[in-house]
């Protein structure tokens, strides 16, 4: 599942080498001056924006309880503002009522501490160019995580780190279609940490999805529900504070 | 079938703590999480907390943080509740209700306890 | 903390009427909300989830609607056993909110 692939490499030819919302390349790159607000800072986790990097955010602590990654999500009751300036996210607002995705974004979750599972809806399904993002904390004696790109009842990319496989930790992936799970692809490059901070970043690609966890690319999991347009929700669940749950085109 | 059987009802004095319990059957505990709400005549419903029996790991209203305390027993399938520092403010009736921890196949506040009437007073 | 308004707050209503209870939250909640019914001198028993979906062995009479941050219940051929109140929920967000609750009662 794993491969080499930088998001350059994927979207080349795209007219758009380095498209907004995204470190140069596909990884943990460090972002040139005035880039993509994922150059890490002094006491982040590489790849971690500064604070108010992120559209709307508000100063470190902004709400109680809030986990500690990505200091200051945004307050509660408020979706991402306008960009913070040159290289933040495009602006943001609610997809239109065609279910199309305008270059503006992102879309999603309102902001604050949200409640797992968690339902993000996406109007019209997945396109390729779709990025979405989730932030979040692992809780402490965590068991699993879980995204789940639903078309209906079929999973079609159900993405599932375990913390304790028989004591071991894994990613296994996998498509559930009429009740029957798929052959698993196993990943073990495991990123996450109990109690640490996360973000997951999710490509739609023509013939695969790519999964980056902090800003370095993880695996990749090839399409076998074919029709994108009608995989029209993610379910967020396991053992997590979730922060944020968005998405956008890039 | 699912059930969620609670405590009997509870007369304590204000300052005390009371300890309510929720006992699950029909249905795998760990598949679910447990919640609290609180419910006084005339004030509506009100979420306390969350307990996943499979870690322990809890989630609470800031409201009810440091007062409130959760707890779950895989062994018996039963969750509990202590309250501390109550207050008049704390009679009520006090529901179990469990929530989906797996997405995907509903259990979103689906099945309840008969609740728990608790009565402060002096 | 999400506002989940609700209305009516009670309506009297026939048996086979066909009835909505509406419910709109404070900010977009992206259909994490459920309704439930609670009988008098009852518990409460949820009634759909996800906005849409009807709960395992909740009669098809009972339908969920919305986007965004207005939803509505409709219950159609009402039917004796429906006299009851109903709330909304959403768990979009930390805390958990509910509606204030909508009595139907026979007329």
């Known amino acids: 599942m794993a491969d080499n692939f930088s998001l350059h490499d994927a979207l080349s030819g795209s007219g758009n080498p380095n498209p907004q919302g995204w470190p140069g390349a596909w990884g943990n790159q460090p972002a040139g001056a005035g880039g993509y607000p994922g150059a890490s800072y002094p006491g982040a986790y590489p790849g971690q924006a500064p604070p108010g990097a992120y559209p709307g955010q508000a100063p470190p602590g902004a709400y109680p309880g809030a986990p500690g990654a990505y200091p200051g999500a945004p307050a509660p009751g408020v979706y991402p503002g306008p960009p913070s300036g040159p290289g933040a996210y495009p602006s943001s607002g609610q997809p239109s009522a065609t279910g199309a995705y305008p270059a503006t974004g992102p879309y999603g979750a309102p902001a604050g501490p949200l409640i797992v599972p968690y339902n993000l809806p996406l109007p019209g399904g997945v396109v390729p160019r779709m990025l979405i993002t989730i932030l979040g904390t692992v809780k402490p004696n965590a068991n699993r995580i879980a995204l789940d790109f639903q078309r209906g009842n079929d999973v079609a990319f159900h993405f599932n780190p375990r913390f304790n496989e028989n004591n071991r930790r894994v990613i296994v992936c996998n498509t559930k279609l009429d009740n029957n799970w798929g052959r698993e692809e196993r990943q073990s490059v495991f990123p996450f940490e109990s109690g640490k901070p996360f973000k997951i970043q999710v490509l739609v690609e023509p013939d695969h999805f790519k999964v980056a966890v902090n800003d370095a690319h993880l695996l990749q999991y090839n399409h076998r529900v074919k029709k994108l347009n009608e995989i029209s929700k993610l379910g967020i669940s396991g053992d997590i504070d979730l922060t944020s749950a968005s998405y956008t085109m890039i | 079938q699912v059930q969620l059987k609670q405590s009997g009802a509870e007369l304590v004095r204000p300052g005390a703590s009371v300890k309510l319990s929720c006992k699950a059957s029909?249905?795998?505990?760990?598949?679910?999480?447990i919640n609290w709400v609180k419910q006084r005549p005339g004030q509506g419903l009100e979420w306390i907390a969350r307990?996943?029996?499979?870690?322990?790991?809890?989630d609470y209203n800031e409201k009810f943080k440091g007062r409130a305390t959760l707890t779950a027993e895989k062994s018996s399938s039963t969750a509990y509740m202590q309250l501390s520092s109550l207050t008049s403010e704390d009679s009520a009736v006090y529901f179990c209700?469990?929530?989906?921890?797996?997405?995907?196949?509903?259990?979103?506040?689906?099945?309840w306890g008969h609740g728990t009437t608790l009565t402060v007073s002096s | 903390d999400i506002l989940m308004t609700q209305s009516p707050s009670s309506m009297s209503v026939s048996l086979g009427d066909t009835v909505s209870i509406t419910c709109h939250a404070s900010?977009?909640?992206?259909?994490?909300m459920g309704w439930l019914q609670q009988k008098p001198g009852k518990s409460f028993k949820g009634l759909i989830y996800h906005a849409t979906n009807l709960e395992d062995g909740v009669p098809s009479r009972f339908s969920g609607s919305g986007s965004g941050a207005d939803y509505s219940l409709t219950i159609s051929s009402l039917e004796s056993e429906d006299f009851a109140d109903y709330y909304c929920?959403?768990?979009?967000?930390?805390?958990?909110?509910f509606g204030s609750g909508t009595k139907l009662e026979i007329k």
């Open positions: 029909g249905y795998t505990f760990t598949d679910y999480y």
């Open positions: 209700a469990r929530f989906a921890y797996y997405y995907g196949s509903g259990g979103y506040f689906d099945y």
């Open positions: 307990i996943y029996p499979g870690t322990g790991n809890t």
């Open positions: 929920v959403q768990y979009a967000q930390f805390p958990p909110t």
């Open positions: 900010q977009g909640i992206n259909s994490n």
